[in-house]
């Protein structure tokens, strides 16, 4: 199965010489970035990137690891230290605060410095930190948020919200005492904290009053509106902008994205998180790639540029379930969105960053043969004389005892999208991991992304590259042809 040409040293020497030639030609751009895009793979640690690369290659009937992901083509790479102020291993709220606002916070808080305390409403005021997206809006750019989770979820919320509890999606989730103290739910903050031009993802139910049936699942009461304050936040948002449009399915999204009269677009395609890519009804729900394209079509109309946050948010969910098939297929769709965005933008004026908020206790090992399925078994048996998969988790729901022992596994089981890879420790949900994650960069000022950095550095690179606060005196030449 090994390609014959790879047995020849010339193959590797020639390949490396080409890579070296490309590296020698890299020239740091001295211009400012007109546009900023941050692609956030939630839970996309380096082991996830590697396994997804192999799967993407195998999907194309190649052996696997020799394939390039779209993110692999970005010329600059750094490592990001993901810890939060109070935890070695962080959550998506504290990390969002770091890479979107440039300040580290505490576990499960969003858009607040570490002086704020989880779940303590009265520690909110005065501890708010401002996102790069907010600063981009103040500078006259258009801004957008795209995610496969709820738009009120921790990662996207870092772009616009300030909350001591990431779980306060709608007012029904906020304790009465906190509501009385003035703490607002995340959905309310989505429409009131700042003017966001494009909002695409899941999370319909948090926007509508309790008892409002969902348009897609009208007979399922649990999918309907959750709000106790009687507010229709979508209606309130539409009333703010003459060119605003709300859509809830793929067809409407594609129409709206091509309509020149639409200036603001909100698309909420599921009551909660969007479906996994493998379960998505492609007639009703758009893919992450399609949402990204729609957002770029609208945002790129602004001559002053744009800021766009794009999240592959369910990579994380697949890992928490210990279902590597789900995590990896979500990662591939995330990478497809990166590739599409690259086709629709220019690296001359657009700084694109790809990173993860944190990793997962997901491993890839066992000396599998080249070309063997990424979902397959390691050669040979373990000490208990049973097979084991090359993909495993350190902890999680994949820990199962059968007759007091680890169950055997066959290849026909391990390939199933429902299969949970085994783990060493039993938990209801697999956990995040604390190792550094990669940051990939391309475009103006991408060369600043180097070395081992705090996660907060990401927000500062974006702000500096686009000459946003606090770097308005950035002393970067505007790109030729940039209009104001």
């Amino acid at each position: 199965i090994i390609p014959v040409e790879e047995e020849n040293p010339d193959f590797w020497n020639r390949q490396a010489a080409e890579a070296l030639g490309a590296a020698k030609k890299l020239q740091p751009a001295q211009t400012a970035a007109k546009n900023l895009i941050i692609f956030l793979g939630d839970g996309m640690g380096v082991s996830t990137v590697t396994a997804a690369r192999i799967l993407k290659g195998q999907k194309k009937d190649k052996l696997g690891p020799e394939t390039f992901l779209a993110m692999d083509r970005f010329p600059y790479v750094a490592l990001s230290k993901t810890y939060s102020v109070d935890k070695h291993v962080p959550d998506s709220g504290a990390t969002a605060t770091a890479y979107l606002c440039g300040v580290k916070g505490n576990f499960q808080t969003i858009g607040l410095s570490a002086a704020a305390r989880f779940n303590q409403c009265n520690t909110t005021r005065g501890n708010e930190v401002i996102s790069v997206m907010n600063r981009a809006k103040k500078a006259g750019k258009s801004v957008g948020v795209v995610t496969t989770t709820r738009v009120q979820h921790a990662s996207p919320a870092g772009a616009y919200a300030h909350t001591v509890n990431r779980n306060w999606y709608s007012d029904a989730d906020v304790p009465a005492s906190a509501r009385q103290e003035g703490c607002q739910d995340i959905a309310t903050q989505l429409i009131s904290n700042m003017d966001i031009d494009v909002i695409l993802g899941g999370g319909r139910k948090y926007m509508f009053p309790m008892g409002t049936p969902d348009p897609e699942y009208p007979d399922d009461y649990s999918q309907g509106g959750t709000r106790l304050d009687g507010k229709n936040l979508v209606q309130e948002w539409l009333a703010k902008h003459q060119g605003a449009r709300y859509v809830w399915n793929r067809t409407e999204l594609l129409q709206a994205s091509l309509d020149p009269s639409v200036t603001h677009l909100m698309g909420l395609f599921e009551p909660g998180d969007m479906k996994y890519e493998i379960h998505r009804d492609s007639t009703l729900d758009p893919s992450l790639m399609e949402m990204t394209e729609a957002a770029l079509l609208l945002l790129s109309r602004n001559p002053r540029g744009f800021f766009l946050f794009v999240e592959g948010g369910r990579i994380d969910h697949g890992h928490h379930e210990s279902r590597a098939y789900r995590a990896l297929t979500e990662t591939i769709m995330f990478d497809d969105a990166i590739e599409r965005a690259g086709q629709l933008t220019s690296e001359e004026d657009t700084l694109s960053l790809v990173t993860a908020d944190h990793s997962h206790v997901f491993s890839f090992g066992g000396y599998p043969l080249r070309g063997s399925s990424i979902f397959g078994l390691a050669p040979g048996k373990a000490r208990d004389r049973k097979a084991y998969t090359v993909l495993l988790y350190g902890n999680g729901p994949g820990y199962v005892l059968k007759d007091g022992a680890r169950p055997d596994v066959t290849e026909s089981e391990s390939g199933s999208p429902e299969y949970r890879q085994q783990s060493a420790v039993p938990l209801d949900g697999e956990t995040h991991a604390g190792e550094d994650v990669a940051v990939f960069a391309r475009g103006p000022q991408a060369h600043l992304v180097h070395g081992v950095q705090e996660q907060t550095f990401i927000a500062h690179v974006m702000a500096f590259a686009a000459c946003l606060e606090p770097y308005t005196a950035c002393d970067l030449a505007p790109r030729a042809g940039t209009t104001d």
Epitope: Q58, D61, Y325, S373, F375, S412, G415, S416, P417
Partner: nanobody
Framework: QVHLVESGGGLVQAGGSLRLSCAAS????????MGWFRQAPGKEREFVAA???????EYADSVKGRFTISRDNAKDTVYLQMNSLKPEDTAVYYC???????????????WGQGTQVTVSS
């Protein structure tokens, strides 16, 4: 989800031919590699043939030159043309789908219910 439904099995004499079909329910059928496996009574399920997204094809040594796999993306269907059948080809034949030929030939994601092929001598 991908639902797979096989058809075309039956009883045939040694040296005869059969054509198995497998219809898939998902619109993105062309993204998947498709394969056939078989399980004879009392034996493990074994790989027979697979056809990838790119059209690349693999066969088990035991069926090379006798069986031909093909696909019609417009009809979301994969076929297995079986010629020069032998009694040892008797088995339940399963259709499978996976992300690429490497995956489908080793660890398919989706399986059909199977169709019985019996070759009499």
């Amino acid at each position: 989800q991908v639902h797979l439904v096989e058809s075309g099995g039956g009883l045939v004499q040694a040296g005869g031919s059969l054509r198995l079909s497998c219809a898939a329910s998902r619109r993105s059928f062309s993204e998947y590699a498709m394969g056939w496996f078989r399980q004879a009574p009392g034996k493990e399920r074994e790989f027979v043939a697979a056809i990838g997204w790119s059209g690349v094809i693999e066969y088990a040594d035991s069926v090379k030159g006798r069986f031909t796999i093909s696909r019609d993306n417009a009809k979301d269907t994969v076929y297995l043309q079986m010629n020069s059948l032998k009694p040892e080809d008797t088995a339940v034949y399963y259709c499978a789908a996976g992300l690429g030929i490497r995956v489908v030939s080793q660890t398919p994601a989706y399986w059909g219910q199977g169709t019985q092929v019996t070759v009499s001598s």
